[in-house]
Interface confidence: low
């Protein structure tokens, strides 16, 4: 008789999850000399240990501590780019501006980007059928707790001027419930961080509004100011031109507003 299995509301573990994590780890350590010391088998064992045999609604940050320890990485604290609801452009930017880093440019972020995973209580099986959805099932699921943990650590490491890329096409440009709004904003360290600079990315070519005056941006400014961190905001009217000007800042067309 087949054993009863919990049906969750979210998609199951990404197929070939163990192989994907291991392959990504090998690839990352090959191309980042400063991480060449990392033993990818140990990284996978620590990752697995965080959720295998545990109830997928009862995962804690402590479960991920062995993985966090193995994945400890120093990125230049003044070169951090946070993002919310605009991952692709943020990643394009760090590919061009190669001395800046998103969370997904670090080993742990790179390993887990776009993947889903969960286990089952008291069995060593990975659940490929379904995993808990953050809203419909529970927030303390393996994926959500992982991103909360690494995002907190990433924000805590930031210093000087921290940049955040926000999606100006969304109804809530700054969303208090996003990872940026609920975790990263609150873990920037006022002793180290002087300024949070928001880049609001416009979607439409004809959109000339000042989205820095948006009520949700004002809300972000208020939260940041209360934490004794300065806030500044820039409209990026032309994201395509913005990337081009990052690559070729001396281009004559880059002196005008982007």
């Amino acid at each position: 008789v087949p054993r009863w299995r919990q049906q969750w509301s979210g998609p199951g573990t990404t197929k070939r999850f163990p192989e994907t994590v291991l392959a990504r780890c090998v690839k990352y350590t090959e191309i980042h000399p400063e991480m060449r010391h990392v033993d990818c088998q140990s990284v996978w064992d620590a990752f697995k240990g965080a959720f295998i045999s545990k109830h997928p609604c009862n995962i804690t940050e402590e479960d991920y501590q062995p993985l966090m320890k193995l994945g400890t990485q120093t990125v230049p604290c003044n070169k951090i780019l946070l993002w919310s609801r605009i991952k692709d452009l943020a990643h394009q930017f760090t590919q061009v501006q190669r001395d800046m880093f998103t969370l997904e440019d670090t080993l742990l972020g790179y390993l887990a980007d776009d993947l889903t995973w969960c286990g089952e209580f008291n069995t060593s099986k990975i659940n490929y059928q379904s995993c808990p959805d953050w809203r419909k099932d529970c927030s303390n699921n393996p994926v959500s707790v992982f991103w909360k943990t690494v995002s907190r650590r990433f924000a805590e490491a930031a210093c000087d001027v921290v940049h955040v890329m926000l999606n100006g096409s969304r109804s809530k440009i700054f969303d208090k419930n996003s990872t940026f709004g609920s975790v990263e904003v609150h873990n920037l360290q006022p002793e180290k961080v002087q300024t949070l600079e928001a880049w609001v990315i416009h979607g439409g070519r004809e959109d000339s509004r000042d989205l820095c005056q948006d009520p949700t941006i004002k809300e972000l400014e208020s939260i940041i100011s209360k934490r004794n961190i300065q806030f500044s905001c820039k409209n990026i009217y032309r994201p395509d031109k913005f990337l081009q000007c990052v690559k070729n800042p001396e281009d004559s067309s880059c002196t005008s507003e982007i």
């Epitope: 090959e30 191309i31 760090t94 190669r98 990337l243």
Partner: antibody, heavy 119, light 106 residues
Framework: QVQLQQSGAELAKPGASVKMSCKAS????????MNWIKQRPGQGLEWIGY????????EYNQKFKDKATLTADKSSGTAYMQLSSLTSEDSAVYYC????????????WGQGTSVTVSS | QIVLTQSPALMSASPGEKVTMTCSAS?????MYWYQQKPRSSPKPWIY???NLASGVPARFSGSGSGTSYSLTISSMEAEDAATYYC?????????FGGGTKLELK
């Protein structure tokens, strides 16, 4: 300035092997991936694979897995590609090109090595 | 593997004419890259990350697109633009090129 200098044309018999070279200069050899691309006469481009010289890590297009072997010599700043069990299908120009792993495109290319397989 | 289909395979344009060529991917890719190749020469990087011009590429060139549909546009054709243009994707191994669009001067 950056240069990728490839070895001269090769004429080989079916079943034989050839090993071509790509000498890099003007940049830090170990900081970039080295790609190899095939172009048959009058045809398009086909990616064979890359090597990361700092660690000798390679990744291949499955199609060329048993055909091409990529190596690199850090001390001389030279990448190599060996092609084995040659057939007429392997007659082509082979380019090496460097790739900065976080973005851009393959930004510098060698002049190409022509391989002719004929009995 | 992701197949990139370029169209048209061959086209001609007069000086000053606007030119658009397309590259269609068999499944979604994150970004598209374009290379220019002239006879008896190595390919040159032309556009990266879909819309960014490589160093030295004239501003009359532009790139756009997302998902499975990408294009390269020349706002005003010049004689030196006659060449074959290849699109290429890095999203999935094997990294693949399109079959090329040969652009001739009319």
């Amino acid at each position: 300035q950056v240069q990728l200098q490839q070895s001269g044309a090769e004429l080989a018999k079916p079943g034989a092997s050839v090993k071509m070279s790509c000498k890099a200069s003007g940049y830090t050899f170990t900081n970039y991936w080295m790609n190899w691309i095939k172009q048959r006469p009058g045809q398009g481009l086909e990616w064979i694979g890359y090597i990361i010289p700092s660690t000798d890590y390679t990744e291949y297009n499955q199609k060329f897995k048993d055909k091409a072997t990529l190596t690199a010599d850090k001390s001389s700043g030279t990448a190599y590609m060996q092609l084995s069990s040659l057939t007429s299908e392997d007659s082509a120009v082979y380019y090496c090109s460097r790739y900065p792993y976080r973005g851009y495109a393959m930004d510098y290319w060698g002049q190409g090595t022509s391989v002719t397989v004929s009995s | 593997q992701i197949v990139l289909t370029q169209s048209p395979a061959l086209m001609s344009a007069s000086p000053g004419e606007k030119v658009t060529m397309t590259c269609s991917a068999s499944s979604s890719v994150s970004y598209m890259y374009w290379y220019q190749q002239k006879p008896r020469s190595s390919p040159k990087p032309w556009i990266y990350l879909t819309s960014n011009l490589a160093s030295g590429v004239p501003a009359r060139f532009s790139g756009s697109g997302s998902g499975t549909s990408y294009s390269l546009t020349i706002s005003s054709m010049e004689a030196e633009d006659a060449a074959t243009y290849y699109c290429q994707q890095w999203s999935t191994n094997p990294w693949t090129f399109g079959g090329g669009t040969k652009l001739e001067l009319k």
